[in-house]
């Protein structure tokens, strides 16, 4: 079909905010569980601690986590798992003050990546029981299909 | 030609990761040499320490550098050089801890800019022999044609 | 009308840089006044301390502020006001060193949001007389209509 001004295909988008964050027993990572705050298009699906890619393609991904933790460095790793392998897409790293009153930093990163159908995207904090602020305007994850 | 659903022109994108970083003798800057990790479209080409713009237009540019340096503040400057002049587009600045074990920070910034055909884009760290982590998920540079 | 290759609708964009920043008497916030550095499309209008949305839709918003302040944590809040209510869209937070020579940090964040016609977008620093660097490549605000 020909694209009219009205029909012109829009970018699929998904903006996610936290439900909670957990560390499994004996795990040295903290994972965030996500819920949609904004969704346009059908190609992305929040599934608990991951996001499933239904439409393969090139995406702008962005991630922010708000840390309230005195551990010397904090940060998040955004990874995709699919086709039998795991790949780190990007990381954000922030040195933290040792004083609890000062230890308050958001860490934002983003990039453009090719995602495959069936990939599961996740945000991992490589610390057990990381102290996060799960406010929806401080910690979030997003996708734009380009 | 009329655009059909299939023909609809996609955004040109380029996501670059480091090959190496060098400071020329007697230089007070560190430059990063780039290689493509993802490219769609023909309008952008990695050229060692710079990226050449072949298609003029409005681009989303993003840059992250991962610093492991105790210098009091670190950061990167993203500039374009063309038509006989140089222009700083955006900067990222991060204060660093003085203790080497804690001095680990990524610095991300991005923005939308009009780039001209023949412009050379570069990422400069205004420090001699800056200590960078050149992991491809910690230090990267990207473009999306809007 | 049918979209041809030439007519194909481009993304509206707006990239803003500071004019100044002020704290009203007895106010515990600092606001930035903006001017356009790049504009494409008619759907967004800088209006002093805010940006008016003329075309409703889904936007990528980004904000960076460059802080030169020893206050223990600094950061900015990006909000929209419209339809009789105010909503925080996203925040950036940065812990600051206590030594003035080291207290130099940019804070960048971004996300995708649905904005309504008539919304006013603003960047607030929740500190009285915050010490900002208003260089256009250190402090800026931007929008891309998706």
């Amino acid at each position: 079909a020909v694209l009219t001004q009205k029909q012109k295909k829009q970018h699929s988008v998904l903006h996610l905010v936290p439900i909670n964050a957990t560390s499994k027993d004996d795990s040295d990572v903290t994972e965030v569980m996500w819920q949609p705050a904004l969704r346009r298009g059908r190609g992305l699906q929040a599934q608990g601690y991951g996001v499933r890619i239904q439409d393969a393609g090139v995406y702008l991904l962005y991630s922010q986590v708000l840390f309230q933790d005195v551990t010397f460095t904090m940060g998040q790793v955004v990874s995709r798992e699919g086709q039998g392998r795991q790949e780190t897409l990007f990381r954000c790293i922030r040195s933290m003050p040792s004083h609890p009153d000062r230890a308050y930093n958001s860490c934002y990163s983003a990039g453009v990546f090719h995602l495959h159908q069936g990939d599961i995207l996740s945000v991992i904090i490589p610390r057990a029981r990381a102290k996060l602020n799960l406010s929806p305007h401080g910690t979030f994850l997003g996708f734009v299909k380009l | 030609a009329v655009l059909t659903q299939k023909q609809k022109k996609q955004h040109s994108v380029l996501h670059l990761v480091p090959i190496n970083a060098t400071s020329k003798d007697d230089s007070d800057v560190t430059e990063v040499m780039w290689q493509p990790a993802l490219r769609r479209g023909r309008g952008l080409q990695a050229q060692g320490y710079g990226v050449r713009i072949q298609d003029a237009g409005v681009y989303l540019l993003y840059s992250q550098v991962l610093f492991q340096d105790v210098t009091f503040t670190m950061g990167q400057v993203v500039s374009r050089e063309g038509q006989g002049r140089q222009e700083t587009l955006f900067r990222c600045i991060r204060s660093m801890p003085s203790h080497p074990d804690r001095a680990y920070n990524s610095c991300y910034s991005a923005g939308v800019f009009h780039l001209h055909q023949g412009d050379i884009l570069s990422v400069i760290i205004p420090r001699a022999r800056a200590k960078l982590n050149l992991s491809p998920h910690g230090t990267f540079l990207g473009f999306v044609k809007l | 009308a049918v979209l041809t290759q030439k007519q194909k609708k481009q993304h509206s964009v707006l990239h803003l840089v500071p004019i100044n920043a002020t704290s009203k008497d007895d106010s515990d916030v600092t606001e930035v006044m903006w001017q356009p550095a790049l504009r494409r499309g008619r759907g967004l209008q800088a209006q002093g301390y805010g940006v008016r949305i003329q075309d409703a839709g889904v936007y990528l918003l980004y904000s960076q502020v460059l802080f030169q302040d020893v206050t223990f944590t600094m950061g900015q809040v990006v909000s929209r006001e419209g339809q009789g209510r105010q909503e925080t869209l996203f925040r950036c937070i940065r812990s600051m060193p206590s030594h003035p020579d080291r207290a130099y940090n940019s804070c960048y964040s971004a996300g995708v949001f649905h904005l309504h016609q008539g919304d006013i977008l603003s960047v607030i620093i929740p500190r009285a007389r915050a010490k900002l660097n208003l260089s256009p490549h250190g402090t800026f605000l931007g929008f891309v209509k998706l």
Partner: antibody, heavy 116, light 107 residues
């Protein structure tokens, strides 16, 4: 020290396929791209393509699309190039080379001879 | 694709001589040109990139120049180890293409 060690010479039949390897050492394999270059006996050099090992993204010279397939195995730090539907025109030395867009380190080459 | 034309195809010179090899691009490639040396039975070795920047470890008797469509590689005071084949390569955009080569022989 960066090293690129290529597999040995191949004698193959027309119409068949061949897969050659480029085993790397001395650097982080997944952080860099590998280029492949063809050199016919007594002739010049031809760029085939490039693969970024970190995610498998590849760029090909249009002339080699459908002919060459670039892959890698991160567990053994080895890059591979498969050539299909071989003809006498594919008889050549094939080099792997590191860095982009100029080539700083080269393998020693793999000689492929296509003959009935 | 951009065509690269090298000249001469071959030349003879003596140890101590200076020689110049030229390379012409079919379109403007600015300064995006590399030069390689290849000895018989060996892999190519990078000499120059960005038209004039010497690669690490390359002796200073080698120098590159030119921009746009015309480029040259000059070797001052030829040494015995300098004899072999020389290739130019544009790195303006993919596909990267090479010149046909220049064979430098001992007179």
């Amino acid at each position: 020290e960066v090293q690129l060690q290529q597999s040995g010479a191949e004698l193959v039949r027309p119409g068949s396929s061949v897969k050659m390897s480029c085993k790397t050492s001395g650097y982080t394999f997944t952080s860099y791209g590998i280029n492949w270059v063809k050199q016919r006996p007594g002739q010049g050099l031809e760029w085939i393509g490039y693969i970024y090992i970190g995610n498998g993204y590849a760029e090909y010279n249009e002339r080699f699309k459908g002919k060459a397939t670039l892959t890698s195995d991160t567990s053994s730090s080895t890059a591979y190039m498969q050539l299909s539907s071989l003809t006498s025109e594919d008889s050549a030395i094939y080099f792997c080379a590191l860095y982009y867009p100029w080539f700083t380190y080269w393998g020693q080459g793999t000689l492929v001879t296509v003959s009935a | 694709d951009i065509q690269m034309t090298q000249s001469p195809a071959s030349l003879s010179a003596s140890v101590g001589d200076s020689v110049t090899i030229t390379c012409r691009a079919s379109e403007n490639i600015y300064s995006y040109l590399a030069w390689y040396q290849q000895k018989q039975g060996k892999s190519p070795q990078l000499l120059v990139y960005n038209a004039k920047t010497l690669a690490e470890g390359v002796p200073s008797r080698f120098s590159g120049s030119g921009s746009g469509t015309q480029f040259s590689l000059k070797i001052n005071s030829l040494q015995p180890e300098d004899f072999g084949n020389y290739y130019c390569q544009h790195h303006y955009d993919t596909p990267f293409t090479f010149g046909g080569g220049t064979k430098l022989e001992i007179k």
